[in-house]
Structure formats: C-alpha cells, structure tokens
Amino acid sequence: LTCLGGFASPGPVPPSTALRELIEELVNITQNQKAPLCNGSMVWSINLTAGMYCAALESLINVSGCSAIEKTQRMLSGFCPHKVSAGQFSSLHVRDTKIEVAQFVKDLLLHLKKLFREGQFN
C-alpha cells in the first residue's frame, strides 16, 4: 500500500493513484508559476533512478518558506520509506550540480510522466 494518509490523501491509496496525484500537483506548480518559483532557490540535482523519491525529498526539503512546494514535499514523504530531514543527502544527489527549483520540478515531472506511461508505479 502507498500510505499517504495524513499528508495529502484521505488514506492509503494504490501506488498508481499516488503517482497520478503527485504528477498533477507538479503540473499545477508548473502551470501556475508566475514569479520565479521559491524566489529562484537552488537545490541539488538528483539522479532520476531507483530511490529518486527520497532523493527528491532530500533535495526539496532544504527549501524553506516556499508554500508552492509544501504539498509536493508532503506527497513525496509518502513515497519515501524513511524520515527525511533538512541537511540529509543520499548518493543519488549530483552534489556538484545545483539547479533552480523550477527546473528541478520540470525535470521530475517529465520523468514521473514517463514512469506513469510505462506503468512503473512502485
């Protein structure tokens, strides 16, 4: 089960439903972006491979005071089996590359859409 209860969903949901909702939230962010997202904050780029949900959360959790990505942070925490806190980094970060949050969200969205189309929900 994908348990996102208490974060964004009304309770446990199938993995495909959780991924579908995460994609829609990222679409929301990209569509509604007017001013630079999170004031142009920079985050570590990640390898979009196995374990990317935790890596994405580890990267985005270091952005504070940005309400536009708070829901995304909560949703990603539902995909990550361990607790993530600011300053935590995994080997999946490309530690020599920082990108704007807006670009990070776009890259993540493109990859998640690909996974969804290919039926990779877990």
Partner: antibody, heavy 118, light 107 residues
C-alpha cells in the same frame, strides 16, 4: 448532482476519425478526472483513458496511437477522438468521473452507441 | 496489464437466493477492487469499492470481500431488481481493467 451526457455521430465509416463529446453538468471539469470507457456489443468494458482537472492526459497503451482526449473548460465538455477506426471500434462509449485520490468510477454517462460500417 | 477473470460468466438464480460471484486478478492488487452492476441498455453503477466498502445508496444485501488476487461479491438475498450483469475492476495500476462480467439471470 454531477451528470454526464455523451453525444456523437452514431455511424462512422472505416478509416475515418470518430469524435465524441461528453458534457458535464452540476460540476466542473476543472476538478477530478474525466474518463472514457467503451463496451463492444455483448462484451465487457475497456478503459480508454482520462483527462485530468489540469488538462493532463493518460491513454491506454493498447489504443494510444489512435486516441486524443481534450477538453473545453468554457463549455464544461471533454471530447474523445479515435482515428483510423475499424469495425472493432464499434461499441457503446461512456464517459465517467473518477474523483481525486480514487480509482473507481462513481458517476457515469448513459453512453452513446457508435457503429463503424461503410 | 493486470488481467481480471470473473466466474461464473453467467448463473441462474431465484428471488431470495444467496448469490456469489468471484473475481481473480492476475497479480496482487491488495484491496484495490471495485464492483459494478449493469442492466441492459444502461451504464454501469458503482456498488462496492476497496473490495468491501459499500458505495452510497447501495442496499446492504450487497457485500464484497477478498484481498490480494481473489475477491467475492455476494448478494445475500436476491431481489427482482438485482438481475443484471456484474463487473469487477482493478485500481492497482493503469491501465485500469475490468473482468469479463457475470450475468445473473432469473431461473
């Protein structure tokens, strides 16, 4: 109460493009997910795909090359285009709602019958 | 795609009978299964979701059970309005798939 009403041509010639419309009343297509499902005569149900409240789409891979789902928010309508149709596309076509965070179809239109024949 | 197999494909029963329909998934779908009722010339209607949760307004004579790969829809006491075709649907992964249907006919 949300209601769905499908409309379409009824008869389409082989190799042509089938165009169907689903009008949503009592609710907004700018919320939830709006799906197309079809049922060939005397057979079971086949999932076609959806358009989301954001306008994002998903198509069943088995039909992907044929399908386009779009929407007109000003008219509160979604549409299905199915290209290069054959007799195998003869079916009753339903639109159905799927609420956010769910995976079951709680509201259905009454369906529209499409026959592919020359 | 996940294949959904229903059995039997049809059955004959009398008013008042207890009727059981089964649905088998080709892989584990946890409890992400719903049941629909369809009458001739009409759209399907949602009866049960999450394997056993009754949709709003559905009579309590309908019940669902199961998890993993095997599921059951039970009508405890068949009523005249229950003669219809019943379909299961999995929500574990896209594309969503339906069973082939079980037609409940009057004996």
């Amino acid at each position: 109460e949300v209601q769905l009403q499908e409309s379409g041509p009824g008869l389409v010639k082989p190799s042509e493009t089938l165009s169907l419309t689903c009008t949503v009343s009592g609710g907004s297509i700018s919320s939830d997910y709006w799906n197309w499902i079809r049922q060939p005569p005397g057979k079971g149900l086949e999932y076609i795909g959806y358009i989301s409240y954001n306008g994002n789409t998903y198509y069943n891979p088995s039909l992907k090359s044929q399908i386009t789902i779009s929407r007109d928010t000003s008219k509160n309508q979604l549409s299905l285009k199915l290209s290069s149709v054959t007799a195998a596309d003869t079916a009753v076509y339903y639109c159905a709602r799927l609420a956010k965070w769910t995976w079951y179809f709680d509201i259905w239109g009454q369906g529209t019958t499409v026959t592919v024949s020359s | 795609d996940i294949q959904m197999t229903q059995s039997p494909s049809s059955l004959s029963a009398s008013v008042g009978d207890r009727v059981t329909i089964t649905c088998h998934a080709s892989q584990n779908i946890n409890v992400w299964l719903s049941w629909y009722q369809q009458k001739p010339g009409k759209a399907p209607k949602l009866l049960i979701y999450k394997a056993s949760d009754l949709h709003t307004g559905v009579p309590s004579r309908f019940s669902g059970s199961g998890s993993g790969t095997d599921f059951t829809l039970t009508i405890s006491s068949l009523q005249p309005e229950d003669f219809a075709t019943y379909y299961c649907q999995q929500g574990q992964s896209y594309p969503y798939t339906f069973g082939g249907g079980t037609k409940v006919e009057i004996k």
